[in-house]
Structure formats: structure tokens, C-alpha cells
């Protein structure tokens, strides 16, 4: 492989690290547009025990600007030193380096739901993966954010054990024939910046006069 | 050699706010935390926060939830930790600790002393 | 958070002898990692803290090899096989497995 100096410093790239389904992924974007690699190359080492870098078998030659590292990356302690390389065909135009904190620079989206909507209550269904690794857990809590006609109002469901398979949970004594939008996010214990997710609604069919009664009591 | 120096000390008025620096040497500034430790008078030692200089990330102790902010400036290799809303209870020498792991501070400044008096 | 308990409080000590001290946490520290984040360091009079220990028993580079470190889960212990004046001072111990990171109170180690 040749390698063309390239006129790029570790600036040439942003990366980011999101908890996306309870998978790592790493995901980069050139500063340079410019630049089109045909392929990128993404290896890494650990900090506290430096050894000769290690080429991410799933992100060797890809043609991806991501990288699932759920499998490689486990401790949220550790920095990750990682190196990513972009090639056009054998030619090397820029190698960028970043180090990585977990514990810090995870940032985490919200996971996937769908609602229901009856007559004086919502059914929220909440997608978590059948099987979450304990690492990958970081203390996170399931907030539900229900909104209508301008009031917000914040739902902490209590999830035994760890953050897996589907879970439902019920938003009730609500208002029929009333208009409601429901955001899910995962909140961190040390309330950093929260991801929320595009906001689903659904409008509550009209109850019966006794029923209407009953829930604008 | 690994150096961390922080800035002089601070006296200042209740309701004000400091901006306490760390400037490192002698390392590559982007590839270790840089952990921030407070000291009062005659006590123990109380974890602030850390902060990801290349990336600007940042984990804060929730007891200093909006107290402290936590910024890098990678260009002069410097760590800064601002203080608001002063009060007594913020009279402390504060410290900044280099870490290749989270919680190593393998290398501590000398400490910035913060006085809080009207 | 996690309480790391430190004793003694106050250690005083002859030149030449041996110092021990024990620091518990309420939890263990063992991370899922498999590594258990909780290091010692030291605190002369008017100075800045210099770590000494880390990993529980790893000894920083220039630290004296009568220091060591050892424990595991909850409880930790730090031993001086035979104390030099240079070695008083305010030992912590501090655990960084679980946030937030959190200090012992510290023991005072003086000459008697």
C-alpha cells in the first residue's frame, strides 16, 4: 500500500459513539468533502495496556462510515485509541486518531415504540433487544413523555432487572376524543444531554357520555 | 516531564463566578481525561467531574450539577473549570488530575485556592 | 454513591516500623470489566496529592517497593513494611468503578 502524505491531521474527522439498540456504534464524517475513500479501515488499542493496533474484523475495508464495536469495546473505564484510515483503492489519503471514553462520550438514542391509543389511555410498547450485556446497561432509566395541549408530563416506568426484551407500559386516565403525543428517551444517571425520540400521536377515540364524565372527574 | 499548572489563587465575592485553568505539558493533551477534584479546608477529597479533551465530553458528580461547567481548549493545551453563583460552601483549593483511564489521576497540578468572602 | 470507609483515622508510628491501613467500600468494585478500579494515594503536608497505588495493587513508577496494596470486593488494605519520614502524610484511598467516584476520609499518618 502506498501512502501519499496526506495534508490531514486527526482534525480531518468527527466521530461518535451512540448506543443505538443497546449496540455500540461508532460513526464518522469527513471534514473534506472532497475526500471520497473508496473504503475505510478502523483499528484500535486500549490505553492502559498499549499494544500494536487491532484491526476491527467487521470494519476492515468497508465501505461504511460506521462501525458496530459492541463486541470489542466492553469496558466503560477504558480509552480506546482508535485510528481510522481511508483509502482510495491502495492509496492511504488520511489516517485520523481519536480516543474514546465510553463512560463520557456515549451518547444514546432513544429506542424504538410504537403507541395505542383507547379511550382513556394509551398503550406505549417500548423495543428493547431480547438480550442486553450488563456493560452496555450504564444506568440508564426509560422515560416516557406524554404531551398534550401543551402539558408535558413525564412517566419513569420501574423496569425489574436489566433493559431487555419488549416492555409496555400504560399512560391512563386520559381524556378522550383528546389529542395526545408520546416521546420515549433513555435518561443517564448523570443527566447529560438526553436524545429524545420524534414524537408519535394519536388522537383517542370519543367515549361514551358516562365514560367521558368519569375521566374529566 | 508530565506537568499540570494551574492557575493562581482567587479571591472573590459571594454571587460571582471563577474560571480555575489547567494547563498541561509534557503529554499529548487529547489523549487523557482531565478529572477535576475539590478540597476544603481541613477535609477530604470530593470528585467533581471529568471532561474528554478531544472531544469536549464531559461527566460531572451530580452534586456539582450546575454549579461547575467543564470546557478544553486543545489549541493551548488547557483544562478550565468555571464556578457560578459563589457561595462560602465553594471556598476550597480545587485540583486537576490527568487520567489515561477513568479514575487513574496519575498526575495531579499543584491546586487552585478558591476563597469565597464578602 | 459509594462510602469508602478509612481506618484508622490517625496512625502514629515509629520510624522503621510497620503501618497498616483499611479501607472498605459500601459495595463491591470488582467492575464488569473484570478490573477493580479503587487506588490509593498520598498527601504530604501543603502539597498536592501523588497517586502511589492503582488496580488495587500496581505501584506507580517511583514508589518505593516497601509499599503495598492488596484486597479485593469490599475491603482493601494499604501496608508500609517500614515507614520513613517521607512517608507522612494523609493517605485516601478512592474507588472509580461506580459514579460517581468517591474518596475514603483519608488517614493521617504521623510519627508518635
Known amino acids: 500500500i502506498s501512502y501519499d502524505s496526506p495534508d490531514y491531521t486527526d482534525e480531518s474527522c468527527t466521530f461518535k459513539i451512540s448506543l443505538r439498540n443497546f449496540r455500540s456504534i461508532l460513526s464518522w464524517e469527513l471534514k473534506n468533502h472532497s475526500i471520497v475513500p473508496t473504503h475505510y479501515t478502523l483499528l484500535y488499542t486500549i490505553m492502559s495496556k498499549p499494544e500494536d493496533l487491532k484491526v476491527v474484523k467487521n470494519c476492515a475495508n468497508t465501505t461504511r462510515s460506521f462501525c458496530d464495536l459492541t463486541d470489542e469495546w466492553r469496558s466503560t473505564h477504558e480509552a480506546y485509541v482508535t485510528v481510522l484510515e481511508g483509502f482510495s483503492g491502495n492509496t492511504t489519503l488520511f489516517s485520523c486518531s481519536h480516543n474514546f471514553w465510553l463512560a463520557i462520550d456515549m451518547s444514546f438514542e432513544p429506542p424504538e415504540f410504537e403507541i395505542v391509543g383507547f379511550t382513556n389511555h394509551i398503550n406505549v410498547m417500548v423495543k428493547f433487544p431480547s438480550i442486553v450485556e450488563e456493560e452496555l446497561q450504564f444506568d440508564l432509566s426509560l422515560v416516557i413523555e406524554e404531551q398534550s395541549e401543551g402539558i408535558v408530563k413525564k412517566h419513569k416506568p420501574e423496569i425489574k432487572g436489566n433493559m431487555s426484551g419488549n416492555f409496555t407500559y400504560i399512560i391512563d386516565k386520559l381524556i378522550p376524543n383528546t389529542n395526545y403525543c408520546v416521546s420515549v428517551y433513555l435518561e443517564h444517571s448523570d443527566e447529560q444531554a438526553v436524545i429524545k425520540s420524534p414524537l408519535k400521536c394519536t388522537l383517542l377515540p370519543p367515549g361514551q357520555e358516562s365514560e367521558s364524565a368519569e375521566s374529566a372527574k | 516531564q508530565v506537568q499540570l499548572q494551574q492557575s493562581g489563587g482567587e479571591l472573590v465575592r459571594p454571587g460571582t463566578s471563577v474560571k480555575v485553568s489547567c494547563k498541561a505539558s509534557?503529554?499529548?493533551?487529547?489523549?487523557?481525561?482531565i478529572e477535576w477534584v475539590k478540597q476544603r479546608p481541613g477535609q477530604g477529597l470530593d470528585w467533581i467531574g471529568m471532561?474528554?479533551?478531544?472531544?469536549?465530553?464531559?461527566k460531572c458528580n451530580k452534586k456539582f450539577k450546575g454549579k461547575v461547567t467543564l470546557t478544553a481548549d486543545k489549541s493551548s493545551s488547557t483544562a478550565y473549570m468555571h464556578l457560578s453563583s459563589l457561595t462560602s460552601d465553594d471556598s476550597a483549593v480545587y485540583f486537576c488530575?490527568?487520567?489515561?483511564?477513568?479514575?487513574?489521576?496519575?498526575?495531579w497540578g499543584q491546586g487552585t485556592s478558591v476563597t469565597v468572602s464578602s | 454513591d459509594i462510602v469508602m470507609t478509612q481506618t484508622p483515622l490517625t496512625l502514629s508510628v515509629t520510624i522503621g516500623q510497620p503501618a497498616s491501613i483499611s479501607c472498605k467500600s459500601s459495595?463491591?468494585?470488582?467492575?464488569?470489566?473484570?478490573?477493580?478500579?479503587l487506588n490509593w494515594l498520598l498527601q504530604r503536608p501543603g502539597q498536592s496529592p501523588k497517586r502511589l497505588i492503582y488496580?488495587?495493587?500496581k505501584l506507580d513508577s517511583g514508589v518505593p517497593d516497601r509499599f503495598t496494596g492488596s484486597g479485593s470486593g469490599t475491603d482493601f488494605t494499604l501496608k508500609i513494611s517500614r515507614v520513613e519520614a517521607e512517608d507522612l502524610g494523609v493517605y485516601y484511598c478512592?474507588?472509580?468503578?461506580?459514579?460517581?467516584?468517591?474518596f475514603g476520609g483519608g488517614t493521617k499518618l504521623e510519627l508518635k
Open positions: 478512592w474507588q472509580g468503578t461506580h459514579f460517581p467516584q468517591t
Open positions: 488530575a490527568r487520567s489515561g483511564w477513568v479514575s487513574a489521576m496519575d498526575y
Open positions: 509534557g503529554y499529548a493533551f487529547t489523549n487523557y481525561l
Open positions: 459495595q463491591s468494585l470488582l467492575d464488569s470489566d473484570g478490573k477493580t478500579y
Open positions: 488496580l488495587v495493587s
Open positions: 471532561i474528554n479533551p478531544g472531544s469536549g465530553g464531559t
